[in-house]
């Protein structure tokens, strides 16, 4: 429906306090390196205006556009050029041109200082003096360093972390309180990040069609009783949400993810039975649960499907009469039949039928061409099985820390190229799905396994995608979106890659690394381990053991010494060598 | 509640048209392949035709020309026109879901039926 | 195709096994439906896909069969069962057919 004032319009219906949150967000994530201060500012003059239009929608400019208005507003920051340079050309387009360039200049890797938790008594001081600031200050922090954070569960974050900090302020033991819930919303945070990532990749680089397949495999495996024409309305719903928070449109998302849960349990009785907990929630709650809900029973009764899609005679001309319908309605009932597939793996599937019917209804015998077809399938559904299985022994065998450094060096030697915090990074979070997925019984494992890998390569792919250097990991990421794990996993040892030179500073540890977390342990480590494998590719596991074993022996060492920094520089120099001579360097 | 409901039976005469309407209650009929069939007083079903998700319709041999499928999806009901009547037209006439908007069968979802009489 | 179903009618008593044969023209797979119905009433699902047993209904009705042959047996005839049976093809196109029926009437 067209409203007199759009601003209006999505301030009355989000309320102030949404409004607020979700314009800072919005200019936070689109101007990452402005000062809290200054987005506030802008908040605020932002926010005064809306009220003028709520009071009179037809008072002068209440009738722009919101890219209108809000890219006006980031324009008139005063530091544009000297703080990002060419974003400042932005300026000089006009709509929609303009908010497009600003989407293109959001940087997945911002060069931030990284967040530093004070002391709980600081925080809960800072959450006493000033709740409105301090909690706006978490968004802002959070939506700069994360350019494509899901606006609306932001909010629900932020709701979680007003009631850590309401609760354990006032606990007996605030920091026993207050700290595994930060650290529980980090974590979370995190992931959600990166799916959300993945969702705004596949709109933007693989298009809107990519996304609505990805949903119908989805839904119809989290709702399989629910029948084609529910789920196409909901992959519609779902994909107009995701494409406005994706393109920076975050009031109307937030707006339209309100609507679409309200209907989604005003309908449950044709959605799914396990919708009842979450539609009793308020709506921050109610939204986050939805996307949450664990998968419906399959319902009874359930043909093969063999007799509409293989062996009945008229698939070239339902095909041809209705490819949308027809390859849709073939994903959702393989998908609602399936919950024990991935949905990369059910995509697959699909694609794998749709060109056997562009090529087989082309033919002379079509049914005869096609009659195999679900046979091409069992190849493409044991490959990620096996993989799944493969790792998950090597997982357990391993524990996480050690099954990460193997996953480094693999990686390390596919795409030795890529930066070492990258890879780093990627691997660690590669490794994380033994202890994520590996839990879980047979039927559960593939769609955690390789869905989740699917959200860490593409971490891969976007930070590769800002200063590209490696042009099998561009091959990877840009082919097939559905492909990208198969295609990762195909990669043999780079045997274009010139060892890089030994530089032994890289390897030079100081005392500092005593006082360090063991997971900032871990990183270090980890750090040195690509660093071994880019210098010496062809080392075997055995040498890089080695290695390895006698750099913790070290590190343990030093840290217990009286004199750790002397330890460190004199052991440190001995291990370098020791370490070049065992690799032959 | 899920259910079809069939109307627009009667007696009509030789040469004479009618249309069938079936209601669906508690679905979305657009989800589904939507089938009519027949039964002479006493005698056999007898598939007339369906029509699919991607609005194909398909007949019966015999059906062909004188029967037609159509569907309106705002009004969740879908309707079989028959043309040229003759006596042996005569039966219930029912509608049935498909198993999927491309299925020619199992239907495991039925209306009760609409009596058609053709005679002078 | 074509779908021959026999005997047209059966007479039988409370308790008995009965079997009831479909035979198609030609090889439809496992794409046979059975269907029991009563006078003034739709036809009910039993089985599909040849052997797999409609949800609520009772466990004595089992189906078997694929290609061209197939069987309905009721393991023990309950007084309810007495009624029509047709099986159904289905799958080989986007056409169907349906069995002349099997009366199963009380002896």
């Known amino acids: 429906d067209a409203h007199k004032s759009e601003v209006a319009h999505r301030f009355k219906d989000l309320g102030e306090e949404n409004f607020k949150a979700l314009v800072l967000i919005a200019f936070a994530q689109y101007l990452q390196q402005c000062p809290f201060e200054d987005h506030v500012k802008l908040v605020n003059e932002v926010t005064e205006f809306a009220k003028t239009c709520v009071a009179d929608e037809s008072a002068e400019n209440c009738d722009k556009s919101l890219h209108t208005l809000f890219g006006d507003k980031l324009c008139t920051v005063a530091t544009l050029r000297e703080t990002y340079g060419e974003m400042a050309d932005c300026c000089a387009k006009q709509e929609p041109e303009r908010n497009e360039c600003f989407l293109q200049h959001k940087d997945d890797n911002p060069n931030l200082p990284r967040l530093v938790r004070p002391e709980v008594d600081v925080m809960c001081t800072a959450f006493h003096d000033n709740e409105e600031t301090f909690l706006k200050k978490y968004l802002y922090e959070i939506a700069r360093r994360h350019p494509y954070f899901y606006a609306p569960e932001l909010l629900f974050f932020a709701k979680r972390y007003k009631a850590a900090f309401t609760e354990c302020c006032q606990a007996a033991d605030k920091a026993a309180c207050l700290l595994p819930k930060l650290d529980e919303l980090r974590d979370e945070g995190k992931a959600s990040s990166a799916k959300q990532r993945l969702k705004c990749a596949s709109l933007q680089k693989f298009g809107e069609r990519a996304f609505k397949a990805w949903a119908v495999a989805r839904l119809s495996q989290r709702f399989p009783k629910a029948e084609f024409a529910e789920v196409s309305k909901l992959v519609t719903d779902l994909t107009k949400v995701h494409t406005e928070c994706c393109h920076g449109d975050l009031l109307e998302c937030a707006d339209d993810r309100a609507d679409l849960a309200k209907y989604i349990c005003e309908n449950q009785d044709s959605i799914s039975s396990k919708l009842k907990e979450c539609c009793e929630k308020p709506l921050l709650e109610k939204s986050h649960c939805i996307a949450e809900v664990e998968n419906d029973e399959m319902p009874a009764d359930l043909p093969s499907l063999a007799a509409d899609f293989v062996e009945s005679k008229d698939v070239c001309k339902n095909y041809a009469e209705a490819k949308d319908v027809f390859l849709g309605m073939f994903l959702y009932e393989y998908a609602r039949r399936h919950p024990d597939y991935s949905v990369v793996l059910l995509l697959r599937l699909a694609k794998t039928y749709e060109t056997t019917l562009e090529k087989c209804c082309a033919a002379a015998d079509p049914h005869e061409c096609y009659a195999k077809v679900f046979d091409e399938f069992k190849p493409l559904v044991e490959e990620p099985q096996n993989l799944i299985k493969q790792n998950c022994e090597l997982f357990e065998q391993l524990g996480e820390y050690k099954f990460q450094n193997a996953l480094l060096v693999r990686y390390t030697k596919k795409v030795p190229q890529v930066s070492t915090p990258t890879l780093v990074e990627v691997s660690r979070n590669l490794g994380k799905v033994g202890s994520k997925c590996c839990k879980h019984p047979e039927a559960k494992r593939m769609p955690c396994a390789e869905d989740y890998l699917s959200v860490v390569l593409n971490q891969l792919c976007v930070l590769h995608e800002k200063t590209p250097v490696s042009d099998r990991v561009t091959k990877c990421c840009t082919e097939s979106l559905v492909n990208r794990r198969p295609c990762f996993s195909a990669l043999e040892v780079d045997e274009t890659y010139v060892p890089k030179e030994f530089n032994a500073e890289t390897f030079t540890f100081h005392a500092d690394i005593c006082t360090l977390s063991e997971k900032e342990r871990q990183i270090k480590k980890q750090t040195a381990l690509v660093e071994l494998v880019k210098h010496k590719p062809k080392a075997t596991k055995e040498q890089l053991k080695a290695v390895m074993d006698d750099f913790a022996a070290f590190v343990e060492k030093c840290c217990k010494a009286d004199d750790k920094e002397t330890c460190f520089a004199e052991e440190g120099k001995k291990l370098v060598a020791a370490s070049q001579a065992a690799l032959g360097l | 509640e899920v259910q079809l409901v069939e109307s627009g039976g009667g007696l009509v005469q030789p040469g004479g048209s009618l249309r069938l309407s079936c209601a669906a209650s508690g679905f979305s009929l657009s989800s589904y392949a939507m089938n009519w069939v027949r039964q002479a007083p006493g005698k056999c079903l007898e598939w007339i035709g369906h029509?699919?998700?991607?609005?194909?319709?398909y007949y019966a041999t015999w059906a062909k020309g004188r029967f037609t499928i159509s569907r309106d999806n705002s009004k969740n009901t879908v309707y079989l026109q028959m043309n040229s009547l003759r006596a042996e037209d005569t039966a219930v006439y029912f509608c049935a879901r498909g198993a999927g908007g491309f299925s020619t069968g199992p239907f495991k979802l039925w209306g009760q039926g609409t009596l058609v009489t053709v005679s002078s | 195709f074509e779908l021959t179903q026999s005997p047209s009618s059966l007479s039988a008593s409370v308790g008995d096994r009965v079997t009831i044969t479909c035979q198609a023209s030609?090889?439809?797979?496992?794409?046979l439906a059975w269907y029991q119905q009563k006078p003034g009433q739709p036809p009910k699902l039993l089985i599909y896909?040849?052997?797999d047993l409609t949800s609520g209904v009772p466990s004595r009705f089992s189906g078997s069969g694929s290609g061209t042959d197939f069987t309905l047996t009721i393991s023990s005839l309950q007084p309810e069962d007495f009624a029509t049976y047709y099986c159904q093809g289905y799958g080989g196109s986007s056409t169907t057919t349906f069995g002349c029926g099997t009366k199963l009437t009380v002896l």
């Open positions: 896909d040849a052997s």
């Open positions: 029509i699919n998700a991607g609005d194909i319709a």
């Open positions: 030609e090889s439809i797979n496992s794409r």
